[in-house]
């Protein structure tokens, strides 16, 4: 017979989910409204593409990136659709509290919609970290609590330092990677004897890992210049996304097999470092003057990842309990560091002729920039974690940790739990 | 304090292309970029372009066929150049600090900072 | 291209009045709106940058507000020296675009 889900749970989530949902219906009605002037036919379909790209990139492909688990396969892509489709309706409604409430309505536009499925997605990265520890009741608590946070990081941000939407959004990866690292730290970390094979990656399900790391490499770009206006940047910003990944393919995988003894090649690394380049890129992708230095910087991130993979998963086993397969959080914490230091370094390079005064002020305010969204991502995930490990989310067992059947209907096994 | 300096052709005939240079005193000429705006007699303003240090530049789909702009790096100076002039062209031009290219430096609208203006005339 | 709108296109008031200028985007621009003052023969000064923030300078007289499609320029008690010209600028998207402009004159 099919596991069933916990009796607890089943009271908790359904009731849990849908009243949540019925009260961002009640706020739609009476908070929002569609934009209602006319936008041109082209500008509209162009903005509307990115936008697909971009769901494109979440469901998809951080869908399918975490589902490289034995058994939390099926776990791993439908959660990451129901915190994408959760995630986006919070964060709409967000924005529109946060930067435009005093004028009445919360007018939604693409470019809204855009801005809540980027917010979104910083939820997918996160939960890579706790993922097959955690139930739905607890995802969604999480959900809430990481898009609020990096809601109001991008309005602090914004105001503070004057950043404009591309800027603030691009703290999306340090942000996410160390708010999703807190959470796990939070959480119970020893797999109990009899469990190891659980967080172990299976064929089938790294093939379809394979596949999300695969639509993320195509659509990366459209992520990095979804919010940049100006045609001249959006153009850099797509051509060094893409150098900068093409390379990082390169190198994980030539880098992979030059980190294992016999010279194979680890799907687990390859997952995560064709990507790297991507992230690295980030910040200043609109900025990067040539080819060539999106390229060296896509090189240094396959390294970088490759070698974090190798390296860092042990540690991060131990203190945060974090399976080897779930990468993304420390590897997206070292290339979105990367990606700001570039920054920085660039800004220092284009402000030489200006003055000291000038470049050292330039350079604290990045700093702060980047310190605030290290902070707010540790505390609120520290919150979120602390939250999460309350009895009223009925938590699974340890013993059913990264296992679908707690949560899934399999009429054709027969393995009772 | 940053200030901007700016000259060029005065007064055109129809068909010739006018030409204008801004120099860019006491400022980081490569975080920001530089806008062109011109405004006929009794008439609004009219953004014509943008252009960073190395060349990038954004153009005003109305003039983009007969638009070009320039950047010398070593110089502080940006240029425009504007083809095929006609009568209706006939405007004050003022060169200003656009957005910065980096958050924080600034306020990343731009436009904090004009030239005086140069008055071209298009006449034959 | 973004249509910007101004309302009214001039207007007469006296000095200490309480003056409203209004801009209409013809699609939302979310913040990104500047308001600019210009006097005859000299370069336009920025008053108002992100719809509501206050330019460094100038006096606090002069406020900003709105969001999306619908912003206004406030000045709360007119001095001589506020008779001019003043302009809206969106920059949220390119081509970058000014409103007609509106004529403020002593009455």
């Known amino acids: 017979m099919s596991s069933k889900y916990p009796r607890s749970v089943r009271r908790c989530l359904p009731l849990w989910a849908l009243t949540l949902e019925a009260a961002l219906i009640l706020l739609f009605y009476f908070f929002t409204h569609y934009d209602a002037s006319l936008e041109d036919q082209k500008g509209l379909v162009a903005s509307y593409q990115v936008g697909q790209d971009l769901t494109v990139m979440a469901a998809i492909g951080l869908g399918f990136l975490t589902s490289s688990f034995r058994r939390h396969s099926w776990s791993s892509v439908a959660f990451n659709l129901f915190m994408l489709a959760l995630g986006v309706q919070w964060a709409i409604l967000l924005d529109g509290f946060l930067s435009q409430f005093p004028s009445g309505k919360v007018v939604i536009t693409l470019f809204s919609i855009r801005l809540a499925t980027m917010s979104a997605l910083s939820v997918l990265i996160s939960v890579d970290a706790v993922l097959g520890k955690v139930n739905l009741a607890q995802l969604v608590v999480m959900v809430l609590v990481e898009v609020t946070a990096l809601g109001n990081l991008r309005m602090v941000i914004s105001n503070i330092f004057n950043t404009d939407y591309h800027m603030n959004m691009m703290h999306i990866y340090v942000f996410a990677a160390y708010f999703g690292l807190s959470v796990a730290w939070c959480l119970p970390k020893p797999l109990p004897e009899g469990t190891e094979d659980k967080d172990q990656t299976a064929t089938i399900p790294s093939l379809s890992a394979m596949l999300g790391a695969l639509f993320l490499w195509m659509f990366w770009p459209s992520f990095n210049s979804a919010l940049l206006r100006s045609p001249i940047e959006r153009k850099n910003a797509v051509f060094n996304t893409y150098y900068a990944v093409a390379v990082s393919v390169v190198t994980a995988i030539s880098g992979s097999s030059l980190a294992h003894p016999q010279g194979k090649i680890s799907k687990t690394y390859v997952h995560s470092a064709v990507l790297a380049g991507g992230v690295a890129v980030g910040t200043s992708c609109h900025l990067i003057p040539s080819p060539w230095l999106a390229m060296v910087l896509g090189l240094v991130a396959g390294l970088i990842s490759v070698g974090g993979a190798k390296y860092l998963p042990g540690c991060c086993n131990r203190v945060l309990g974090i399976p080897h397969s779930s990468i993304m959080g420390y590897n997206f914490s070292l290339l979105g560091l990367l990606g700001e230091i570039i920054y920085i370094v660039l800004l220092v390079l284009d402000t030489v002729g200006a003055g000291n005064g000038m470049i050292g002020f330039q350079v604290l305010l990045s700093i702060g920039e980047l310190s605030l969204a290290i902070v707010i991502a540790l505390m609120s995930g520290l919150l979120t974690g602390l939250l999460l490990n309350l009895k009223i989310w009925k938590a699974p067992h340890e013993a059913k940790y990264f296992d679908d059947q707690v949560f899934w209907k399999f009429p054709h096994l027969a393995v009772g739990f | 304090q940053v200030h901007l300096q700016q000259w060029g052709t005065g007064l055109l005939k129809p068909s010739e292309t006018l030409s204008l240079t801004c120099a860019v005193h006491?400022?980081?000429?490569?975080?920001?970029?530089w806008t062109w705006i011109r405004q006929p007699p009794g008439k609004a303003l009219e953004w014509i372009g943008e252009?960073?240090?190395?060349?990038?530049?954004n153009y005003n789909p109305s003039l983009k066929s007969r638009v070009t702009m320039s950047a010398d790096t070593s110089k502080n100076q940006f240029s425009l150049k504007l083809t095929s002039v006609t009568a209706a062209d006939t405007a004050v031009f003022y060169c200003?600090?656009?957005?910065?290219?980096?958050?924080?430096?600034?306020?990343?609208?731009?436009?904090?900072?004009w030239g005086p203006g140069t008055t071209v005339t298009v006449s034959s | 291209d973004i249509q910007m709108t101004q309302s009214p296109s001039s207007l007469s008031a006296s000095v200490g009045d309480r003056v409203t200028i209004t801009c209409r985007a013809s699609q939302v621009i979310r913040n990104d709106l500047v308001w600019f003052q210009q006097k005859p023969g000299i370069a336009p000064k920025r008053l108002i940058y992100?719809?509501?923030s206050l330019q460094s300078g100038v006096p606090s007289r002069f406020s900003g507000s709105g969001f999306g499609t619908e912003f206004t320029l406030t000045i709360s008690s007119l001095q001589p020296e506020d008779f001019a010209t003043y302009y809206c600028l969106q920059h949220f998207s390119y081509p970058y675009t000014f409103g007609q402009g509106t004529k403020l004159e002593i009455k």
């Open positions: 992100a719809a509501s």
């Open positions: 006491g400022g980081s000429f490569n975080v920001y970029y």
């Open positions: 252009i960073n240090h190395s060349g990038g530049a």
């Open positions: 200003a600090r656009g957005r910065s290219r980096y958050s924080g430096y600034g306020f990343y609208s731009g436009m904090d900072v």
